[in-house]
Structure formats: C-alpha cells, structure tokens
C-alpha cells in the first residue's frame, strides 16, 4: 500500500502534569493518520492511539508504570484509510519525540488550600494533597506519596488591607503561621520541587482564600 | 538488577584530600537519590548528605556541611564524595546507598562500603 | 535536627522467641498530606551493609520475612520480630526519613541467647 503522500509528524512535545502525560505534535492531518510508539530506553516499543487522525496521544498508562524511567516516543504516519497489512515492508515515516523523564520533568499542578482554622494569634493552612495516576499495588499515590520530602510547598500570605506580602514554607502539607488579631488575611500556595534546576520546579500559585469565607473557621 | 559500587580502601595521611566513588548501574541514576553514610569504628550511622544526580541538587547535614563536597556524573553514573583536608577523625566506614522508588521510603540499595582510614 | 532514641540498646534474645524495639522520634513525623509516617528501619548483619527492612513506618521492603513488622505514629514506633532466627542477629536501627537533616537511632544490638 506504500506510504506515498504522507509527511513525518514533527515538533513532538510533551505536555504532563501531575503525570498526567499526553504527547502533542504537528501537521494536523490530510489524508494520513498517525500511530504512536513508546519505550524506554531499554524496553521494547509498544503502541499506542493506532491510527488516529489527532495529533496528541495520551501515555499516562505507560509512564506512570515506572516514573522514574526516561522515556522515548516516536510518531508513525500512514496513508488515511491505512490497514496494517503482512506483507508491506516498507517502513512508515516517522518522528522521535525528546526523551522525558517523568519524575523529574512533569509539572506540578496547582495547588488547592483545602482549610485553613484560626485559633487565637495563629492561623493553620492546610494544602490538599493532589492524586496523581502513579499506583502502588492497586491504589493511588499522592504527590506527596511519589515526591515525599523532595516536594515543599509555600505560602504567600497578607493581610486584606495591605499589599505586603509574608512568606512561609513547609516541608509537609501544613503552615502554622502567627496573623495580628482581629486582622483578617488572604493566602495563596505554590508547590515546589527545590531539587529541580528548570521551569517546572515551581506551580502556579493557587486560587486566592481569604480569612471571612467559607473555607475558613475561627476559634478564640 | 540494580547495584551500587564503592571504589576500594584508602589509607590517607591528615590533611590530604580524597575523593571516593559509588557507580551506580541497573536503574535510572538521574532519578534517584545517592546517600552518603557515616560509620565510624564501633559505632552508629551517621547521615552525611545526598545528590539527585539528575539536577545536581545536594542536601548536607550540619555536621558534615563544609568538609565534605557530594557531586555526580551522570555520564557514567557515578557519584562521589570528597575532602580537600582530611583528618585523622575522618577514619571511618563510608557507605553510599540509593533512595527507594517512593517518597521518602528509606534507602533500598546499599554499596559494599570503602574504608577511609586517616593516621600520620 | 530530629532526634531518634532506641531502646534496648542490647536485646538478647532465645531464638523462636518474639523481640521488640523500641523507637521514639523528637518530633513527629507524620506527613499530614498523605497521613504517612516516614519512619524507617534496618538491619545492619555482622561485617555486613545495612539493609532496608520497613518503610512508612509499616511498609515491609520487598523480600523481607514477614516475621518482621513496624508500627507506630507519630513520635512512637515499634519494629517486632514474631519468631527471632540465627539469622537476624545484628544492629538494627530506625531513621528518620521526614525531613533533612535525615537522622539514624544509635542502634540496637539483638543477639542470640
């Protein structure tokens, strides 16, 4: 059935967060459709989204087997209409994607304050652990569960009058932090991964909670 | 099978350096914490530090900050650990390990140990 | 730094018979994210490296006996061998896997009786 016609996938990228890890990349297709392989770097290729007229293929399935494997994907293009056949040879054209490293390269989502609880002179903010796809036996990990101590988190805090802002980090999903009384303050997160050197050692802030709302509770 | 290879015994004079390496093989090196463990003659472990090779990010104990430097190649998977002045309380039992595959889930590989020994 | 102190320093032990340590960190260490405690224990053989038996606190590490059991939270953990065998002779020691500076007991000797 040859492969006339048809042009190589490029610009592979990888999009992940919390590994949730899909694989993006161009043209979209005319009259062609695309197949996607992954191994690691001593693994076999196994594949993935036969055949499909998208142009992102998620491997969540795959990397969160072994998050800590570096990863290598390639991208097939086949005549629309394609059907695997035994007896052709000649081989599809195709694009490797950049080694991923999921442990070290997925982003960090962003955070959610699931409470925080005024007692006197001190406010505790606790941040939600986030559920990842990664699994030990038949349950799922947390965040914290896959990064442990490697994952820190901050807290921007302020009081709602003023704009200065204080800062405060923890190494577990809890602040305990000192307020003025009778002040009320706002808070945000961010979760961050000091070990990392790149972009994606820190999240986005999460929303804003403010002292006076729903999420907040006050005892004297 | 994962491993992790210490280089061999040392016998050193105070105030020499001395750098001692721990190659890694049979899993990814960049992901994985390489520790460093203290045990002088008779005693306890003592933590000195780590390297996540695939960064270069280092944590140190206080008591070992500014004496010893942790490093890594990842090129060859191997890490080390070194003294620009060695002294003579520096004669000890040196291991390295590596991190278990979960979040802080203790040291799941050890190296067989390089003996450091320090006397004039 | 968290300080983590053992007790026996010495259990001498009749093999089949149960042996108990005891590890009592200074502060706590359960992770409030994922209610997990990083506590860690190993057994250091005779002229041997050390060598992980539990994690979190209760997690057996694969290949070890299921003589062998953790528990505890918070500041006070327990490692119990069931049934002690000539084989676990050594120094076995707790860890505080929480946060840095990581922190080792000072070790308890079990030997046979």
């Known amino acids: 059935s040859g492969t006339t016609n048809t042009v190589a996938a490029y610009n592979l990228t990888w999009k992940s967060t919390n590994f949730k890890t899909i694989l993006e990349w161009e043209p979209k297709p005319i009259n062609q459709v695309y197949t996607v392989q992954i191994s690691t770097k001593s693994g076999d290729w196994k594949s993935k989204c036969f055949y499909t007229a998208d142009t992102e293929c998620d491997l969540t399935d795959e990397i969160v087997k072994d998050v800590k494997q570096t990863y290598l994907a390639r991208v097939f293009s086949y005549p629309a209409g394609h059907v695997e056949s035994t007896g052709s040879t000649e081989e599809p054209p195709y694009e490797n994607s950049p080694e991923f490293t999921p442990y070290l390269e997925t982003n960090l989502g962003q955070p959610t304050i699931q409470s925080f609880e005024q007692v006197g002179t001190k406010v505790n903010v606790t941040v939600q652990d986030e559920w990842t796809l990664v699994r030990r036996n038949d349950t799922f990990l947390s965040l914290r569960d896959v990064f442990g101590k490697d994952l820190i988190y901050t807290l921007y805090y302020w009081k709602s009058s003023s704009s200065g802002k204080k800062t405060a980090k923890t190494n577990t999903n809890e602040f305990l932090i000192d307020v003025d009384k009778g002040e009320n303050y706002c808070f945000s997160v961010q979760a961050v991964i000091p070990s990392r050197r790149t972009a994606n050692r820190k999240s986005t802030d999460s929303p804003v909670e403010c002292m006076g709302h729903e999420k907040g509770e006050s005892r004297e | 099978e994962v491993q992790l290879v210490q280089s061999g015994a040392e016998v050193k004079k105070p105030g020499e350096s001395l750098r001692i390496s721990c190659k890694g093989s049979?899993?990814?090196?960049?992901?994985?914490?390489i520790e460093w463990v203290r045990q002088m003659p008779g005693k306890g472990l003592e933590w000195m530090g780590d390297?996540?090779?695939?960064?270069?990010?280092?944590n140190y104990s206080p008591s070992f900050q500014g004496h010893v430097t942790i490093s890594a190649d990842k090129s060859i998977s191997t890490a080390y650990l070194q003294w620009s002045s060695l002294k003579a309380s520096d004669t000890a039992m040196y291991y390295c390990?590596?991190?278990?595959?979960?979040?802080?889930?203790?040291?799941?590989?050890w190296g067989q140990g390089t003996l450091v020994t320090v006397s004039s | 730094d968290i300080v983590m102190t053992q007790s026996p320093l010495s259990l001498p032990v009749t093999p089949g018979e149960p042996a108990s340590i005891s590890c009592k960190s200074s502060?706590?260490?359960?992770?409030?994210?994922?209610?997990?405690?990083?506590l860690t224990w190993y057994l250091q053989k005779p002229g041997q490296s050390p060598q992980l038996l539990i994690y979190w606190a209760s997690t057996r590490e694969s290949g070890v006996p299921d003589r062998f059991s953790g528990s505890g939270s918070g500041t006070d953990f327990t490692l119990k061998i069931s049934r002690v065998e000539a084989e676990d002779v050594g120094v076995y020691y707790c860890q505080n896997d929480y946060t840095y500076p990581l922190t080792f007991g000072q070790g308890t000797k079990l030997e046979i009786k």
């Open positions: 502060q706590s260490l359960l992770s409030s994210g994922n209610q997990k405690n990083y």
């Open positions: 049979g899993y990814t090196f960049i992901t994985y914490w």
């Open positions: 390297i996540l090779p695939g960064s270069g990010s280092t």
């Open positions: 390990a590596r991190s278990g595959y979960y979040g802080n889930s203790g040291f799941a590989y």
